[in-house]
C-alpha cells in the first residue's frame, strides 16, 4: 500500500545560488534534501530552514517548510529532508476533522459524567456517563477506554492537505 503524501506548496527556487550544492541524478531521481533541475541534469540542494524533500524524487522545486501557527509549539525544526513538526500547545488539541487549528480542551465533564481521558495534543478530555459507561457521543466505549487514557499518537509534521 502506498504512503499517501498530501499536496504541499511549492517553494519557488531561482536559478541555483552558488552556495547550493549540485550533483547528478541517479536513475533520473534526486536524493532526499534535493530537487531536480528543469533539464533533468542536476540535483540541487534544498535550502535549510526554507524548504525540503523527504524521498528520492524529481521535483522541480523543494517543498516549502511549514511554519507553526500561534497556539502551536515547534517540536522539531524543518531540515532539508524533513518538514517542521508542530504540536498544539498544552491545553489545546487538534482533531482530524479540523486539522487547521488547535481547539481548547474542555475543563471538565458535563453533569452526570466522569472524566476517563485527559486532554492531549490530539484529543479533548474524554467523558463517560457515570451509570451506563457510555461516551458523551453516545457510543459504548471499549473496555480499556474506560480504564486508561490513551497517550496519543506520535507527533507528525503539521503540513495540511492542499
Amino acid at each position: 500500500e502506498s504512503a499517501l503524501i498530501t499536496q504541499q506548496d511549492l517553494a519557488p527556487q531561482q536559478r541555483a545560488a552558488p552556495q547550493q550544492k549540485r550533483s547528478s541524478p541517479s536513475e533520473g531521481l534526486c536524493p532526499p534534501g534535493h530537487h531536480i533541475s528543469e533539464d533533468g541534469r542536476d540535483c540541487i540542494s534544498c535550502k535549510y530552514g526554507q524548504d525540503y524533500s523527504t524521498h528520492w524524487n524529481d521535483l522541480l522545486f523543494c517543498l516549502r517548510c511549514t511554519r507553526c501557527d500561534s497556539g502551536e509549539v515547534e517540536l522539531s525544526p524543518c531540515t532539508t529532508t524533513r518538514n517542521t513538526v508542530c504540536q498544539c500547545e498544552e491545553g489545546t488539541f487538534r482533531e482530524e476533522d479540523s486539522p487547521e487549528m488547535c481547539r481548547k480542551c474542555r475543563t471538565g465533564c458535563p453533569r452526570g459524567m466522569v472524566k476517563v481521558g485527559d486532554c492531549t495534543p490530539w484529543s479533548d478530555i474524554e467523558c463517560v456517563h457515570k451509570e451506563s459507561g457510555t461516551k458523551h457521543s453516545g457510543e459504548v466505549p471499549a473496555v480499556e477506554e474506560t480504564v486508561t487514557s490513551s497517550p496519543g499518537t506520535p507527533a507528525s509534521p503539521c503540513s495540511l492537505s492542499g
Partner: nanobody
Framework: EVQLLESGGGLVQPGGSLRLSCAAS????????VGWFRQAPGKGREFVSA????????YYADSVKGRFTISRDNSKNTVYLQMNSLRPEDTAVYYC???????????????????WGQGTLVTVSS
C-alpha cells in the same frame, strides 16, 4: 500551486477501452515524471504507470503491462492513460499524481506522490 484534473472515467464492459486524461494547471506538473495510481474499493492505492515528460520513458505495473499505455502531450500539459482489454479487477478510482516519491533511486515503483488529482472512477462491468 500544482493542480491536477483527471477526466475520462466511466462505465465500460469487460474487454472494452477507455482513455483517461490528466491536465495540469498552475506551475505545470511540478515534476518531470507524472503517473497514475488507482484505488479499488476497500483496497490501498497502487501504482499503475508513469511517464518521464522530458524523454518519454515509461513505467508500468506488471498487472497492466501490455494492456495500458501512458503518453504525454507537453504542449497541452496533459498526460494520458489508454486502457485496453479492461477487466473487472481494473475497477477503481484512478488518480493522476506528480512529484512521485521513491525509497531508493533504483526503485521502479513509487511509494507515493506530493501532488494528487481528485480521481476519476472507472467501472468495468457487464
Amino acid at each position: 500551486e500544482v493542480q491536477l484534473l483527471e477526466s475520462g472515467g466511466g462505465l465500460v464492459q469487460p474487454g472494452g477501452s477507455l482513455r483517461l486524461s490528466c491536465a495540469a494547471s498552475g506551475r505545470t506538473f511540478g515534476s518531470i515524471r507524472v503517473g497514475w495510481f488507482r484505488q479499488a474499493p476497500g483496497k490501498g492505492r497502487e501504482f499503475v504507470s508513469a511517464i518521464n515528460r522530458n524523454d518519454g520513458t515509461t513505467y508500468y505495473a506488471d498487472s497492466v503491462k501490455g494492456r495500458f499505455t501512458i503518453s504525454r502531450d507537453n504542449s497541452k500539459n496533459t498526460v494520458y492513460l489508454q486502457m485496453n482489454s479492461l477487466r473487472p479487477e481494473d475497477t477503481a478510482v484512478y488518480y493522476c499524481a506528480a512529484g512521485l516519491q521513491y525509497n531508493r533511486a533504483a526503485d521502479r515503483v513509487p511509494v507515493g506522490a506530493v501532488y494528487w488529482g481528485q480521481g476519476t472512477l472507472v467501472t468495468v462491468s457487464s
